[in-house]
Interface confidence: low
């Protein structure tokens, strides 16, 4: 099974995330709750990686980036930059969808549902804040499973 490679420079996303991470994680009052379950991500099979990545990016695009209540102009700029980069990553994945490399199994659907359920258990702005603070988990996931990083 060939990996679905993406050609977005993840360093730029990581840099933007790092610049908002401290603000997000300091404000997060639910320190012992996680939305992106580690066990959940570890259990994803290679054939589900493309689908799961797409699902995670859609989750961030349609929920997290819409729900957060951040008002700081600096932070908003960073979040916009990350959101735009995610769109580029999703564009990159479309090539794999065309080649039928992005089909979703029931396990991937269940794993995605768990993330949405975790998110739904918190009040909307708290859930969005926590998910922004957990972006590093998603970045690690993408890095591990897809990355063909452009040369520095």
């Amino acid at each position: 099974l060939r990996r679905c490679l993406i050609s977005v420079d993840m360093r730029l996303i990581e840099k933007s995330f790092h610049e908002i991470k401290r603000a997000m994680q300091t404000k997060d009052t639910f320190k012992n709750v996680t939305i992106l379950s580690l066990e959940n991500l570890r259990s994803i099979k290679p054939g589900d990686v493309c689908c799961m990545t797409n699902n995670l990016l859609t989750f961030y695009r349609d929920r997290v980036f819409q729900d957060h209540q951040e008002r700081s102009l600096e932070v908003l700029r960073r979040i916009s930059s990350i959101a735009n980069s995610f769109l580029c990553v999703q564009k990159s994945l479309e090539r794999c969808q065309v080649h039928r490399q992005c089909n979703c199994s029931q396990e991937a659907t269940n794993a995605t549902r768990i993330i949405h359920d975790n998110y739904n258990q918190l009040e909307v702005s708290s859930a969005a804040l926590k998910s922004l603070g957990e972006l590093n988990i998603l970045l690690a996931w993408i890095d591990r499973n897809h990355l063909e990083t452009p040369a520095a």
Epitope: E14, K31, A140, D143, A152
Partner: antibody, heavy 122, light 112 residues
Framework: QEQLKESGGGLVQPGGSLKLSCKAS????????FSWVRQAPGKGLEWIGY????????LSAHTVNGRLTISSDNAQNTLYLQLNSLTAADTATYFC???????????????WGPGTLVTVSS | DIVMTQTPASVEAAVGGTVTIKCSAS??????LSWYQQKPGQRPKLLIY???VLTDGVSSRFKGSGSGTEFTLTISDLEAADAATYYC??????????????FGGGTEVVVK
């Protein structure tokens, strides 16, 4: 307040094993990568191993390859180091350190424990 | 494996002066370089990462520069509290070899 605190140091016999703990407080262990770094008396810092909490994988320096195990217990919010077949060269203060991010910032550390001294001697 | 060479091993300067510490990597590490300060009996403290990004709360008297294989830490307007050992560290974690994550040998800064 975010803190790390190592424990388990002391005197160990050559050939013996060592198990150190690093208790995290004020943040969830599972959201960060962690390394163990050691410092022999009067010497510089030596990176010895890293644990990636998302994928559970570890990375070790050549000096401890095959002797080092790093693990974590997210429920206890604690990181562990086990080092086997100890020699006098393993005598050092052992620090646990938190990476400031994943992917490209995983191995640069913004939070350190105070360290715990391990002496390997008969 | 990457080798990080720090120079000088020790440097002495007066209060108000400037100190420059150099760190050289045996192969390109792009901008994957951090600087730490460590005082005797204490844990290291992160000053700079990404070769030039100052950590929150660190004085702007500390300045990091460089990329590739040559890096510099400059401490200006030296204070007595800056007396410490300074370490550079490569963290080019794209490598599967742990020995890419090495520290330099350290530079002791003595403030007169």
């Amino acid at each position: 307040q975010e803190q790390l605190k190592e424990s388990g140091g002391g005197l160990v016999q050559p050939g013996g094993s060592l198990k150190l703990s690093c208790k995290a407080s004020g943040f969830p262990l599972s959201s960060y990568g962690f390394s163990w770094v050691r410092q022999a008396p009067g010497k510089g810092l030596e990176w010895i191993g890293y644990l990636d909490p998302v994928f559970g994988s570890t990375l070790s320096a050549h000096t401890v390859n095959g002797r080092l195990t790093i693990s974590s217990d997210n429920a206890q919010n604690t990181l562990y180091l086990q080092l086997n077949s100890l020699t006098a060269a393993d005598t050092a203060t052992y620090f646990c350190a938190r990476g400031i991010g994943y992917v490209y910032y995983g191995y640069t550390y913004d939070l350190w424990g105070p360290g715990t001294l391990v002496t390997v001697s008969s | 494996d990457i080798v990080m060479t720090q120079t000088p091993a020790s440097v002495e300067a007066a209060v108000g002066g400037t100190v420059t510490i150099k760190c050289s990597a045996s192969a390109s590490i792009y901008e994957y370089l951090s600087w730490y300060q460590q005082k005797p009996g204490q844990r290291p403290k992160l000053l700079i990462y990404g070769a030039s990004v100052l950590t929150d709360g660190v004085s702007s008297r500390f300045k990091g520069s460089g990329s590739g294989t040559e890096f510099t830490l400059t401490i200006s307007d030296l204070e007595a509290a800056d007396a410490a050992t300074y370490y550079c560290q490569s963290y080019n974690d794209g490598s599967s070899s742990g020995d890419a994550h090495v520290f330099g040998g350290g530079t002791e800064v003595v403030v007169k």
